[in-house]
């Protein structure tokens, strides 16, 4: 069956270059036109570039024209996107997508590869407790959490009590701060009566920086 | 370039409902229109091409129609697997423009948020920064307004919000709003409050604390 396997994404500084690859299998590569489409975090789909099956025709979106170059190597069954002079607004998941025969809609898609354009360097998070108190109690239910702050790049994973606690957990999508670093909160609601007896620990893992933090969250002692 | 405009941007519906999404082209594209479905973290999936031709393997509850500049995608009986974001795409011209997307979400019943406020931890204050977090838990619909007040003065530009995806069990959303200040600024003020407005609340709810008090 038709398969498009992408590689080459990663974190890159503004102004630098990156090359994405799209390796095709399950069809005669040299007969098909393949496109690049991207999707910025939380946004819609944006068509980026196309190269015809015979290589004669290349077309680019205005936003990337002059900076991005599409190419293909039929002997390797691979399509490339060379991205130069990268900008923060190029941060997106990039997809390669194959057309159906001669019609220019996208019947087959790659899995996507994330490109992050940022001047930030890899940094592990600081983990701070969001301690339960009378201000975070409502009708027999208490809320507590962890603030996972100032890390780069995405992602971090958060579990509670080594995965034993899942009910009532909300881990929020990360926000990009003006510093270029990410921050997120993970919270859990628990019975107020359990606060004195049950231990609550958030387990934070940031693989890019090899950082693991286990933070015990307890009521503030006054 | 041919511009594609989709409406609505969000559509709330229940399983079994008939739903319709509209896509308009800025100039005629004949029937050169495709529809895609996308779920979080996944690549888009082709549903429909040539405006009304169903892609192989796609259920017949998906119905496409239209030509020229006006197109619709109808789901005749919405099923659980259909809650997703839908995009139209014209392929009449070189620039294969997409619509901005329509998110089909589960229609829940109005639920007011539970509101909690968290002061910055002593650990964080030692680092020179103070984050105050306001949590809105398990509410519907998604629209909620959070306002920060410090010593009763409205804050702007120094907070960030994040909202969860709709909960698969109870259709609700949760939101966190984080007010970030320097330690010096934090220590200049006493009363920190977040005020929440939501359809499920008869009047705004305020949660607050006095700095330095338990």
């Amino acid at each position: 069956q038709v398969q498009l396997v992408q590689s080459g994404g990663g974190v890159v500084q503004p102004g630098r270059s990156l090359r994405l690859s799209c390796a095709a299998s399950g069809f005669t590569f040299s007969r098909y036109t393949i496109h690049w489409v991207r999707q910025a975090p939380g946004k819609g789909l944006e068509w980026v570039a196309v190269m015809s099956y015979n290589g004669n025709n290349k077309h680019y979106a205005d936003s990337v024209n002059g900076r991005f170059t599409i190419s293909r190597n039929d002997s390797k069954n691979t399509l490339y996107l060379n991205m130069n002079s990268l900008r923060p607004e190029d941060t997106a998941v990039y997809y390669c997508a194959r057309i159906r025969d001669t019609a220019m809609f996208f019947a087959h898609w790659g899995q996507g590869t994330l490109v992050t354009v940022s001047s930030a360097s890899t940094k592990g998070p600081s983990v701070f407790p969001l301690a339960p108190s009378s201000k975070s109690t409502s009708g027999g239910t208490a809320a507590l959490g962890c603030l996972v702050k100032d890390y780069f790049p995405e992602p971090v994973t958060v579990s509670w009590n080594s995965g034993a606690l899942t009910s009532g957990v909300h881990t929020f999508p990360a926000v990009l701060q003006s510093s270029g670093l990410y921050s997120l909160s993970s919270v859990v609601t628990v019975p107020s009566s359990s606060l004195g007896t049950q231990t609550y620990i958030c387990n934070v893992n940031h693989k890019p920086s090899n950082t693991k933090v286990d933070k015990k969250v307890e009521p503030k002692s006054c | 370039d041919i511009q594609m405009t989709q409406s609505p941007s969000t559509l709330s519906a229940s399983v079994g409902d008939r739903v319709t999404i509209t896509c308009r082209a800025s100039q005629s594209i004949n029937t050169w229109l495709a529809w895609y479905q996308q779920k979080p973290g996944k690549a888009p999936k082709l549903l429909m091409y040539k405006a009304s031709s169903l892609e192989s393997g796609v259920p017949s509850r998906f119905i496409g129609s239209g030509s020229g500049t006006e197109f619709t995608l109808t789901i005749s009986s919405l099923q659980p697997d259909d809650f997703a974001t839908y995009y139209c795409q014209q392929y009449n011209s070189d620039s294969k423009m997409f619509g901005q997307g329509t998110k089909v979400e589960v229609k829940g019943t109005v639920a007011a948020p539970s509101v909690f406020i968290f002061p910055p931890s002593d650990e964080q204050l030692k680092s020179g920064t103070a984050s105050v977090v306001c949590l809105l838990n398990n509410f519907y619909p998604r629209e909620a307004k959070v306002q920060w007040k410090v010593d009763n003065a409205l804050q702007s530009g120094n907070s960030q919000e994040s909202v969860t995806e709709q909960d698969s069990k109870d259709s609700t959303y949760s939101l966190s709003s984080t007010l970030t200040l320097s330690k010096a600024d934090y220590e200049k003020h006493k009363v920190y409050a977040c005020e929440v407005t939501h359809q499920g609340l008869s009047s705004p709810v305020t949660k607050s604390f006095n700095r330095g008090e338990c």
């Epitope: - | 399983v15 079994g16 409902d17 009986s77 809650f83 589960v106 019943t109 698969s168």
Partner: nanobody, 118 residues
Framework: QVQLQDSGGGLVQAGGSLRLSCAAS????????VAWFRQVPGKERELVAS????????YIEDSVKGRFTISTDNTKSTIYLQLNALKPEDTAVYYC???????????WGQGTQVTVSS
């Protein structure tokens, strides 16, 4: 949550008919949509037909269109699946299901076996 009791299955000759019933209790019947699924051993449950809360919007999968119909009797809180022109490949356990007002089917009948012999 709603409770569902499905019935009406049996052994029938190819070309024959059956009417499956799904009796609902526990919540106002008009408050939710109901669907019929079927499952062959070793395969996933597949949607066959569904009807919305008001009964004015029905959906029948292509594989059974023209042979199966779904209907509702609000007075009896019952949903029916009429199976006509049955084929051996229609042999399966048939389940009715309802979503608890949410984006998934979380209330299920216990299943009723339909066997079509050639």
């Amino acid at each position: 949550q709603v409770q569902l009791q499905d019935s009406g299955g049996g052994l029938v000759q190819a070309g024959g008919s059956l009417r499956l019933s799904c009796a609902a209790s526990g919540r106002t019947f008009s408050g939710y949509s109901v669907a019929w699924f079927r499952q062959v051993p070793g395969k996933e449950r597949e949607l066959v037909a569904s009807i919305n809360r008001s009964g004015d919007n029905t959906y029948i999968e292509d594989s059974v269109k023209g042979r199966f119909t779904i209907s509702t009797d609000n007075t009896k809180s019952t949903i029916y699946l009429q199976l006509n022109a049955l084929k051996p490949e229609d042999t399966a356990v048939y389940y009715c299901a309802a979503p608890y007002g949410l984006g998934r089917y979380d209330s299920w009948g216990q299943g009723t076996q339909v066997t079509v012999s050639s």
